[in-house]
């Protein structure tokens, strides 16, 4: 038996009390697929969140982050403060990378310099807080035709592993607040 609500297109919801009646979504709500029995409240991009795409009756709003912050989480559910290159974000704010580590991005954590000697190389260019070392040839590599400079081994993907992630909940809006999540991530339903 065909669901009487299947005829209701996106932007409407099926009135359960009256079969086959499709009601337009009320203001600031949406249904992105047909056959829905409810419309969901539009996401509001407030505070550090910025509207990237307006809500419509057929699709939710999309948010990104204001300058100085970057998105984290599915659908930009959180905004995390940017740091400078050569820094990482901690609960107390942006801190310089410790000696022997670097970060070449505005986000993520400081990563150890490449250990050239593990590949039998020598350090050609010293590392800094912002840049990895550049490994140079070992004496054995100086034979004709050998490449003179080897790029460092690929660093781990920027971003946090679970142990390293510095998450600060939105309720804690004190001076150390560096990561802001949305208040309204759960869905509200019309009807």
């Amino acid at each position: 038996l065909q669901d009487p609500c299947s005829n209701c297109p996106a932007g409407t919801f099926c009135d359960n009390n009256r079969n086959q009646i499709c009601s337009p979504c009320p203001p600031n709500s949406f249904s992105s697929a047909g056959g829905q029995r409810t419309c969901d409240i539009c996401r509001q991009c407030k505070g550090v969140f910025r509207t990237r795409k307006e809500c419509s009756s057929t699709s939710n709003a999309e948010c990104d982050c204001t300058p100085g912050f970057h998105c984290l989480g599915a659908g930009c559910s959180m905004c995390e403060q940017d740091c400078k290159q050569g820094q990482e974000l901690t609960k107390k704010g942006c801190k310089d990378c410790c000696f022997g580590t670097f970060n070449d991005q505005k986000r993520g954590i400081c990563r150890p310099w490449t250990n050239c000697s593990l590949d039998g190389k020598s350090v050609l260019v010293n590392g800094t807080k912002e840049r990895d070392v550049v490994c140079g040839p070992s004496p054995a590599d100086l034979s004709p035709g050998a490449s003179s400079v080897t790029p460092p081994a690929p660093a781990r993907e920027p971003g946090h592993s679970p142990q390293e992630q510095k998450l600060i909940s939105e309720e804690d809006l004190g001076g150390e607040q560096k990561l802001i999540s949305e208040e309204d991530l759960h869905h509200h339903h019309h009807h």
């Epitope: 005829n7 209701c8 297109p9 996106a10 932007g11 409407t12 009135d15 009390n17 009256r18 009646i21 499709c22 009601s23 337009p24 979504c25 009320p26 203001p27 600031n28 307006e54 419509s56 009756s57 057929t58 699709s59 019309h190 009807h191």
Partner: antibody
């Protein structure tokens, strides 16, 4: 900014036809359903018809069913109302509005008179 | 169809007054009630949606409350630009979309 502009209103004789247009700008027209709402001189608001974002679903007030047809051309950002068999009681300002009824046009006057 | 009844039909008030307009639905409409303001020769303007949510750009002196069948629109301190006609509208069981008959707010 969101703008809706109606056109096509005129003075017509009873029994004749008229087509109204509503041109939208400032928002993604193809993502919104659209309404026509009318207001007789000195009277309240009366909803007339609704069309879904893709044109697949339409609904009419009983007072216009079988006489009025709503349609849209998303490539032209335009909503239409074809009005046939017009009656004196159809005399009104006709407004188009987004499905949320949060933005309305300025209205176009239809006068049905012999 | 759900009928919407507004009271009063007209109202005289002065600048600075607190004004309340009521709207009653013929059956429960939960919180699916919107309020509009219309000035002469102009299109209606959405003020309040979902009974109590203020539409973007609307002054905070406007507020809405209620659920089920009884709703109110309150203007906390009337300004000269608030003299207009106000309509309630249910979005619970539509179509047809139904409006109240309107409340005309006039200067005393």
């Amino acid at each position: 900014q969101v703008q809706l502009v109606e056109s096509g209103g005129d003075v017509v004789q009873p029994g004749r036809s008229l087509r109204l247009s509503c041109t939208a700008s400032g928002f993604t027209f193809s993502s919104f359903g659209m309404h026509w709402v009318r207001q007789a001189p000195g009277k309240g608001l009366e909803w007339v018809t609704f069309l879904s974002y893709d044109g697949s679903y339409k609904y009419y007030a009983d007072s216009v069913k079988g006489r009025f047809t709503i349609s849209r051309d998303n490539s032209k950002n335009t909503l239409y109302l074809q009005m046939n068999s017009l009656r004196a009681e159809d005399t009104a300002i006709f407004y188009c509005a987004r499905d949320w009824l949060d933005y309305w046009g300025q209205g176009t006057l239809v006068t049905v008179s012999s | 169809d759900i009928q919407m009844t507004q009271s009063p039909s007209s109202l005289s008030a002065s600048v600075g007054d607190r004004v309340t307009i009521t709207c009653r639905a013929s059956q429960s409409i939960s919180s699916y009630l919107n309020w509009y303001q219309q000035k002469p020769g102009k299109a209606p303007k959405l003020l309040i949606y979902a009974a109590s949510s203020l539409q973007s750009g609307v002054p905070s002196r406007f507020s809405g409350s209620g659920s089920g069948t009884d709703f109110t629109l309150t203007i906390s301190s009337l300004q000269p630009e608030d003299f207009a006609t106000y309509y309630c509208q249910q979005s619970y069981s539509t179509p047809p979309i139904t409006f109240g008959q309107g409340t005309r707010l006039e200067i005393k």
